[in-house]
């Protein structure tokens, strides 16, 4: 502890200028004071001034008023500092002395004489209020006041509590009168070192290093750090915990970027064709007769089906076609003949067979020729055998399909998969997505290509329902349920008639 006992001398009266021994001072009593402060004694005794002692210079002669003086010699009030816990009780001895010698240092002069002394014993609490008193004896009167105050940075009833206001990272506070800490605005905690974050800042997902701040922990965002960040690349999905990608209605795939209801959302099929939510692009158009193209956007020529027979030539008309028949033929499609085998109607080595008692005929054509009169070389491309926009080319007795990029097979019927290179390690399943292949990994593996062996197996607890296959590897501690047909949801828990094999991320 640390404090100061303060004694303010106010007035001393010694009208007759007498000493304690009855003698008078010549020419007058040049008065200074000795003060001794010590622990409480029921009977004051000589001995060390345990709480401190102080002397004054000569303050006046015989009777005088003592003015307050804050510095230099003759300071008033007198200061008696102590470095211990103030006990609340004390003994005080004030002696008035006459000196014939030096005004400033009378204590050292020989021949000093006692004028009078007073002794005060009692209790005194720490406080700013001065206690005023007056002591008389037969010859003198002394008016004075005193108090005990704590030294700077010491507080409490006994000045025993040290407290220093501070404003750094070990505390932001001021000191209360009892020495307890009073936190500065925006700070809290035992030592006022914990900032009060922005109001509403999520307790677990946010923190702050200074008041009214809200810094988000990884996986969280928003002003109050209460919004999770979905998996990177999640297109049409949301999260309830960080890095999740729970698909919005009508969307599927690891990143919720596969439109499960493309037909309804986009109506891609034209000219009255039928749209199905399936196929490599998520939909397939089935064209009405007379239309073709991926979206049935191309109208077929009315002559495209080669309706004119026997070498008749076809001409397109507004809503139909017209056959121009060669000599010897008639009918809408030139199907009727006026010729017989006698007219040698069969070309290219075709053999003629009479029918209907010779009134008509039929040609039997050699290989690679066709038509009523074997007049046409066989065009193996007429049946549009090449799928997915492939170009048909006749190659002698056979034909080949020249496929568009991304397709293969004899009829261009096979979609070339990014998965063809088998990029997924450790038995991972490959999914073709627009942005490239994505692997869903078997239990115990993760990474873009299932190349990382993980110690924690998120599938170990069997989180997938309804016979779904569990994979890990989308992100740490995540799993993927690949649902069987008829089930959806992050754990394949919902029975809904959706197209099969759309994985959902958990």
């Amino acid at each position: 502890g640390s404090g100061i006992f303060q004694l303010r001398l106010q007035e001393f009266v010694n009208q007759r200028g007498m000493l304690a021994n009855g003698q008078s001072c010549e020419p007058g009593c040049r008065t200074f004071f000795r003060i001794c402060l010590k622990h409480f004694q029921a009977t004051f005794s000589e001995g060390p001034c345990t709480f401190g002692n102080v002397s004054t210079p000569v303050l006046g002669t015989n009777s005088f008023v003592v003015r307050d003086k804050n510095s230099g010699s003759g300071r008033n009030p007198l200061q008696l500092p102590f470095n211990f816990t103030w006990p609340g009780t004390f003994s005080l001895n004030i002696q008035a002395w006459h000196t014939p010698g030096d005004d400033l240092r009378p204590e050292t002069s020989p021949g000093n004489s006692l004028i009078s002394q007073i002794i005060i014993q009692g209790s005194l609490a720490v406080g700013k209020i001065w206690r005023t008193d007056e002591q008389n004896d037969t010859l003198t009167r002394l008016s004075y006041s005193y108090r005990v105050i704590c030294s700077d940075n010491y507080y409490g009833e006994s000045c025993s509590r040290l407290c220093k206001k501070r404003d750094d990272h070990f505390g932001h506070y001021e000191c209360q009168p009892d020495g307890s800490l009073s936190c500065l605005p925006g700070w809290t905690g035992k030592y006022c070192d914990q900032p009060i974050c922005l109001s509403g800042c999520h307790e677990q997902n946010g923190y702050c290093s200074k008041p009214d701040e809200c810094i988000c922990r990884p996986g969280w965002q928003g002003r109050l750090c209460n919004e999770c960040i979905p998996h990177n690349g999640c297109r049409h999905g949301t999260c309830s915990i960080p890095w999740q990608c729970a698909c919005d209605e009508g969307w599927g795939g690891l990143f919720c970027d596969q439109d499960l209801n493309y037909c309804t959302h986009h109506s891609p099929c034209k000219n009255g064709s039928t749209c199905s939510n399936s196929g490599p692009k998520g939909y397939t158009c089935t064209c009405l007769p007379g239309y073709t193209g991926e979206h049935c956007e191309l109208g077929l020529s009315k002559c495209a089906s080669n309706p004119c027979r026997n070498g008749g030539s076809c001409k397109d008309q507004e809503n139909s076609y017209h056959c121009l028949c060669p000599p010897g033929y008639y009918g809408q499609h030139c199907e009727h003949s006026t010729l017989t085998c006698a007219d040698s109607p069969c070309f290219n080595g075709g053999s003629c067979r009479e029918r209907n008692q010779g009134s008509s005929y039929a040609c039997e054509c050699p290989p690679n020729f066709t038509g009523s009169n074997c007049e046409k070389k066989v065009d193996r491309c007429t049946s549009n055998p090449c799928a997915n926009g492939g170009q048909c080319q006749n190659r002698g007795p056979s034909r080949t399909c020249r496929c568009r990029p991304g397709f293969t097979g004899t009829h261009c019927e096979l979609h070339i998969s990014d998965c063809a290179r088998s990029p997924c390690a450790h038995g991972g399943t490959c999914h073709d997505l627009e942005n490239g292949p994505v692997c869903t990994c078997p239990a115990g593996f993760s990474g873009r290509r299932c190349e990382v062996r993980i110690t924690h197996d998120a599938c170990a607890s069997g989180p997938c329902f309804n016979g779904a296959t569990c994979y890990t590897g989308l992100s740490p501690n995540n799993f993927v349920c690949n649902c069987p047909y008829g089930f959806v949801g992050s754990r394949c828990e919902f029975p809904v008639g959706l197209p099969p094999s759309f994985p959902w991320v958990a």
Partner: antibody, heavy 121, light 106 residues
């Protein structure tokens, strides 16, 4: 008993970056009662405070070194690190890591044993 | 920048009292800590918050701090107390050490 252990290269070339790590054992670096500091002592000279860090990542640096110092924390490994860039021979010193206790008014009650880093080509 | 000044050396006879001062502008308004460092060893905290002793520090170590001066007092100095002593205080958010005082026990 809390223990701190400094680790890192003992020799760094001038103009390069000095990197040290302090591993804390016997206590959590994520305690709200402590900051984690770096102090250095050139041979035969006194102590110089470099900077400190709280488990949340809040940092405080000595203004005389601020432009060259970075202190970071990895709570998962119970470690904190010091990087001092563009070093010169004047950065040759024993580097200590220490725990600064809020309840002790910022007094450092635990220190590492120190690691001597020499800057020389 | 804030500076703390210490005498370079203090000599004391065994059993006597050694006083080490540390001066800085209005240092009494800050908390002072004291560290003991023996050759080849890490510093050890001997006084914190002006006058408090950590557990394990002998009672002969005491401290005070007022005005512009903090003082570390070693009463009944022993030969094992021979070491360098550093005062330390915080100036806002920056730690500041004194230059150090070598205490020699004669």
């Amino acid at each position: 008993e809390v223990q701190l252990q400094e680790s890192g290269p003992g020799l760094v070339k001038p103009s390069e970056t000095l990197s040290l790590t302090c591993t804390v054992s016997g206590g959590s670096i994520s305690s709200s009662s402590y900051y984690w500091g770096w102090i250095r002592q050139p041979p035969g000279k006194g102590l110089e405070w470099i900077g400190d860090i709280y488990y949340t990542g809040s940092t405080y640096y000595n203004p005389s070194l601020k432009s060259r110092v970075t202190i970071s924390v990895d709570t998962s490994k119970n470690q904190f690190s010091l990087k001092l860039s563009s070093v010169t021979a004047a950065d040759t010193a024993v580097y200590y890591c220490a725990r600064e206790a809020v309840p002790l008014g910022g007094g450092s009650d635990y220190w590492g044993q120190g690691t001597l880093v020499t800057v020389s080509s | 920048s804030y500076e703390l000044t210490q005498p370079p050396s203090v000599s004391v006879s065994p059993g006597q009292t050694a006083s080490i001062t540390c001066s800085g502008q209005r240092l009494g308004d800050k908390y002072a800590s004291w560290y003991q460092q023996k050759p080849g060893q890490s510093p050890v905290l001997v006084i914190y918050e002006d006058s408090k002793r950590p557990s394990g520090i002998p009672e002969r170590f005491s401290g005070s701090n007022s005005g512009d001066t903090a003082t570390l007092t070693i009463s009944g100095t022993q030969p094992m107390d021979e070491a360098d002593y550093y005062c330390q205080a915080w100036d806002r958010d920056t730690g500041v050490f004194g230059y150090g005082t070598k205490v020699t026990v004669l």
